[in-house]
């Protein structure tokens, strides 16, 4: 018995070969002897039943001259898994067709962190093995159900599942979209008074995107977090529902999600969490955003540089006179110099020598007041 493997929804070709390599009379039947189709000597394909009943069955007329009389079954269904009989030259050839199906749990669009379950449906009596390869090259194998917990952004793309049965294989390709922001976290460094822009690009594109979102903000100086803005998303158009009066936020009406603050102030420094709930999805997308604000000031004989917001302990804060060595450099959030000499002073926030934020302040001779450029 010849074995042919097929994929639901696609086509399968069941072979039937003549020893004489020329056109001859043949008939394809179901195992219960019902006729499917055949050729009875006039080179015309005769179907066994009503057109609607047999419209998925066909043969390759072009192959008949070469003594090949395949049965083509289109739009395969799971119930097509059975034995088919080809009758030609006073002999019967049995061909077993097994149709398989691999599906993703409920949806192919999954939120980051959710689980993906791939299920293999196979005909009774079959004992296939299945192995799936993720877009990032990770292999998972198992029985009829394969699970991947904690989906990551790199899991977005085409998953390839190979079903193996009796040394024959059939390959399935499933497109999985992991719904997430491009970055889990971002940090913005600004001098006091500068404009601030926050961007929240999504890592996926869909034709219609609908949902709602909110940005909660925990200012470093505040005891509790506060909702800064709530918005709706309808077919990729953003509409603001409610916005705090301080700060005066503006939000762009089209993707990627984008917010602007007119100016960076110490009282705004802190961490935000933007959540986006998508229609017909359980769970939410999250992106953390951090704002670090720097201020350089001179009061009487004290030149001070301060930063507010979530800074890493390894960041260095320095005060230096332009083109000179740093006068003071500490892993702290405030540094100062007493009786600074006149000139242009620089306050620098740096990470392993890379300057993240810089603020200049001009110190005038002691009889005048400082100038902040």
């Amino acid at each position: 018995k010849t074995l042919v493997l097929g994929k639901e929804g696609e086509s399968a070709e069941l072979p039937c070969e003549s020893s004489q390599k020329k056109i001859t009379v043949f008939t394809w039947k179901f195992s219960d002897q019902r006729k499917i189709l055949g050729q009875h000597g006039k080179g015309v394909l005769i179907r066994g039943g009503s057109p609607s009943q047999f419209d998925r069955f066909d043969s390759k007329k072009g192959a008949w001259e070469k003594g090949s009389f395949p049965l083509i079954i289109n739009k395969l269904k799971m119930e097509d898994s059975q034995t088919y009989i080809c009758e030609l030259e006073n002999r019967k050839e049995e061909v077993e067709l097994w149709v398989f199906k691999v599906t993703a749990n409920s949806d192919t669009h999954l939120l980051q962190g959710q689980s993906l379950t791939l299920t293999l449906e196979s005909p009774p009596g079959s004992s296939p093995s299945v192995q799936c390869r993720s877009p990032r090259g990770k292999n998972i194998q198992g029985g009829k159900t394969l699970s991947v917990s904690q989906l990551e952004l790199q899991d977005s793309g085409t998953w390839t599942c190979t079903v193996l049965q009796n040394q024959k294989k059939v390959e399935f390709k499933i497109d999985i979209v992991v719904l997430a922001f491009q970055k889990a976290s971002s940090i913005v460094y600004k001098k006091e008074g500068e404009q601030v822009e926050f961007s929240f690009p999504l890592a996926f594109t869909v034709e219609k995107l609908t949902g709602s979102g909110e940005l909660w903000w925990q200012a470093e100086r505040a005891s509790s977090s506060k909702s800064w803005i709530t918005f709706d998303l309808k077919n990729k158009e953003v509409s603001v529902k409610r916005v705090t009066q301080d700060p005066k936020l503006q939000m762009g009406k089209k993707l990627p999600l984008h917010l602007t603050l007119p100016q960076a102030l110490p009282q705004y420094a802190g961490s935000g969490n933007l959540t986006l709930a998508l229609e017909a999805k359980t769970g939410k997308l999250h992106q953390e955003v951090n704002l670090v604000v720097m201020r350089a000031t001179q009061l009487q004989k004290n030149l001070t540089c301060e930063v507010w917001g979530p800074t890493s302990p390894k960041l260095m804060l320095s005060l230096k006179l332009e083109n000179k060595e740093a006068k003071v450099s500490k892993r702290e959030k405030a540094v100062w110099v007493l009786n600074p000499e006149a000139g242009m002073w620089q306050c620098l926030l740096s990470d392993s020598g890379q300057v993240l934020l810089e603020s200049n302040i001009k110190v005038l001779p002691t009889w005048s007041t400082p100038v902040q450029p």
Partner: antibody
């Protein structure tokens, strides 16, 4: 070719009402956001009101909020601007404009209809 | 609402001149800005969208650029048909706002 044609302008007394229409041809109306923009005699352009393609979200300039209402009828491919409590400063040429698919600019404009508010 | 400050309000130039018009936004607006040309008695026409994209059918002498919240429209070599009024429009968020306009006149 996409065309927009405004109508409904005219002379009205202060405190009166008027309804402007903008008939669109050559496009699937519900796909695009639409806006009304006006221009007072000898002055610059002023955005007045906007509506999302779905018709669910409407937006207004502060100068007309509470007095003007923007609506659309997708079956008639028509945009409307209901103007109530009209003032002399509402005197202008009113244009309707269609936005691009991604709300990125006003790519098609009508020729405008004139509204005069005077006693 | 976001304010758009356009300058200059009027400008005299000759055919062949290079001209620049600027708009400054009171808030960050990404690239969500368009430049429109209007001739007397006519509806405005889009020249540039998304700060620097040239609208189909618009001559390449028109170009747009952005630096932070400052936006510039440049006409590299003025042609007689370019004498008109130019407006910037922020479509970052509602309510949309136009600049005050720049009237470009023949010197």
């Amino acid at each position: 070719e996409v065309e927009l044609l405004e109508s409904g302008g005219g002379l009205v007394q202060p405190g009166g009402s008027l309804r402007l229409s903008c008939a669109a041809s050559g496009l699937t109306f519900s796909t695009f956001a639409m806006s009304w923009v006006r221009q007072a005699p000898g002055k610059g352009l002023e955005w007045v009101s906007g509506i999302s393609g779905s018709g669910e979200n409407t937006y207004y300039a502060d100068s007309v909020k509470g007095r003007f209402t923007i609506t659309s009828d997708n079956s008639k491919n028509t945009l409307y601007l209901q103007m109530n409590s009209l003032r002399a400063e509402d005197t202008a040429v009113y244009y309707c404009a269609k936005e691009g698919y991604n709300w990125n600019y006003m790519d098609v404009w009508g020729k405008g209809t004139t509204v005069t508010v005077s006693s | 609402a976001i304010q758009m400050t356009q300058s200059p309000s009027s400008l005299s130039a000759s055919v062949g001149d290079r001209v620049t018009i600027t708009c400054r936004a009171s808030h960050g607006i990404r690239n969500d800005l368009g430049w429109y040309q209007q001739k007397p008695g006519k509806a405005p026409k889009v020249l540039i969208y998304e700060a620097s994209s040239l609208q189909s059918g618009v001559p390449s002498r028109f170009s747009g650029s952005r630096s932070g919240t400052d936006f510039t429209l440049t006409i590299s070599s003025l042609q007689p048909e370019d004498f008109a009024t130019y407006y910037c429009l922020q479509d970052y968020t509602y309510p949309y706002t136009f600049g005050q306009g720049t009237k470009l006149e023949i010197k």
